[in-house]
Amino acid sequence: FGISGRHSITVTTVASAGNIGEDGILSCTFEPDIKLSDIVIQWLKEGVLGLVHEFKEGKDELSEQDEMFRGRTAVFADQVIVGNASLRLKNVQLTDAGTYKCYIITSKGKGNANLEYKTGAFSMPEVNVDYNASSETLRCEAPRWFPQPTVVWASQVDQGANFSEVSNTSFELNSENVTMKVVSVLYNVTINNTYSCMIENDIAKATGDIKVTESEIKRRSHLQLLNSKA
């Protein structure tokens, strides 16, 4: 097909982060076209010569795909017709980080948008009471982080208190020699209090909470990706 009129179509991307070793999504949407055969999606990465992925005439066209993405990419083919050009990236690598371009051609015109993709490792922390310790102690563990994060303890009762003097954090390299296990121990814990173990790097921030009372222990944890914006 040809583009007969000079029109720009709106393409929207969202900055995101990938967890190395897992699958990731590079988000991209565009003004849909009525015919799937008239839609071309090209994903490019700055610094890479070949294409990350190309979808045209209703199917993948991978003859110009760069070697580093071979067998690792897919679009959501059934959602292209409604304007979803997002890319699934399998087995995210540290080297996948960088600037990507989602480039769209339809019968209405062309458009493109860039997105920053960060890669690293992040995982949910789990906080437990360490019964083996001589004093009341909490142990915060998270299996996979990269780059090396910071760990900060906080408590509901002693808000604003600095626990760096009564805590100890260690980082243990995992078997694949990239990610690390995070272990942080907090000493001199008092009962009837809620403690938070906050782990953060430039990609993600995760918090593990533990509420310790005479009768029960309650745990909660959550993780948020940082700097994800349109």
């Epitope: 610094g47 760069d66 062309k110």
Partner: antibody
């Protein structure tokens, strides 16, 4: 300030070799693909070769395939073009240029290669 | 291989509008870039992605691309715009147009 400075040009006999260098500064060299483009006297621009940011992938124009090799040393922020089996038709000003998506956004001032007996 | 055709020369009076064309099969589906080259100097990017301008390039430079023709338009032409102009696309390598010499009368 982003800068590309080529060097290594000169006069060389047909069949001989020459290596061009391009020193880059002012940007993260590893994150950008790079190109060599040449211009014969009084002629238009001709793309020669491109290399990915990591140096893992390279493309060549048919006219130089098998004779020229593009490479880069990311620790030195330097791009190279090794030119073997030079011919008279390789006489040109050689520019290094930073690739930006489907185009080139920064060019060096060029270095002159003359192949003559 | 993909070919781009430009007129060898375009002449225009100062203050008028110059249009330089670049022809290629279904070029409208490609991303076109334009370079200005003055004698003895390196090329300079003046328009990228069909119609976008790098910082520092005057608004007088604009581009369009549809069908089989891309066009570089220079409005209110000045003497300093006299140069060679090249269009370019990527097709598993950089493909340059044949070049157009812009003469300001």
């Amino acid at each position: 300030e982003v800068q590309l400075v080529e060097s290594g040009g000169g006069v060389v006999q047909p069949g001989r070799s020459l290596r061009l260098s391009c020193a880059a500064s002012g940007f993260t060299f590893t994150s950008r693909a790079m190109n060599w483009v040449r211009q014969a006297p009084g002629k238009g621009l001709e793309w020669v070769s491109a290399i990915s940011g990591s140096g893992a992938t390279a493309y060549y124009a048919d006219s130089v395939k098998g004779r020229f090799t593009i490479s880069r040393d990311n620790s030195k922020n330097t791009l190279y073009l090794q030119m073997n089996s030079l011919r008279a038709e390789d006489t040109a000003v050689y520019y290094c240029a930073r690739k930006r998506w489907y185009g080139m956004d920064v060019w060096g001032q060029g270095t002159t290669v003359t192949v003559s007996s | 291989s993909y070919e781009l055709t430009q007129p060898p020369s375009v002449s225009v009076a100062p203050g008028k509008t110059a249009r330089i064309t670049c022809g290629g099969n279904n070029i409208g589906s490609k991303s076109v870039h334009w370079y200005q080259q003055k004698p003895g100097q390196a090329p300079v990017l003046v328009v990228y992605d069909d119609s976008d301008r790098p910082s520092g390039i005057p608004e007088r430079f604009s581009g369009s691309n549809s069908g089989n023709t891309a066009t570089l338009t220079i409005s209110r032409v000045e003497a300093g715009d006299e140069a060679d102009y090249y269009c370019q696309v990527w097709d598993r390598g950089m493909i340059f147009g044949t070049g157009t010499k812009l003469t300001v009368l």
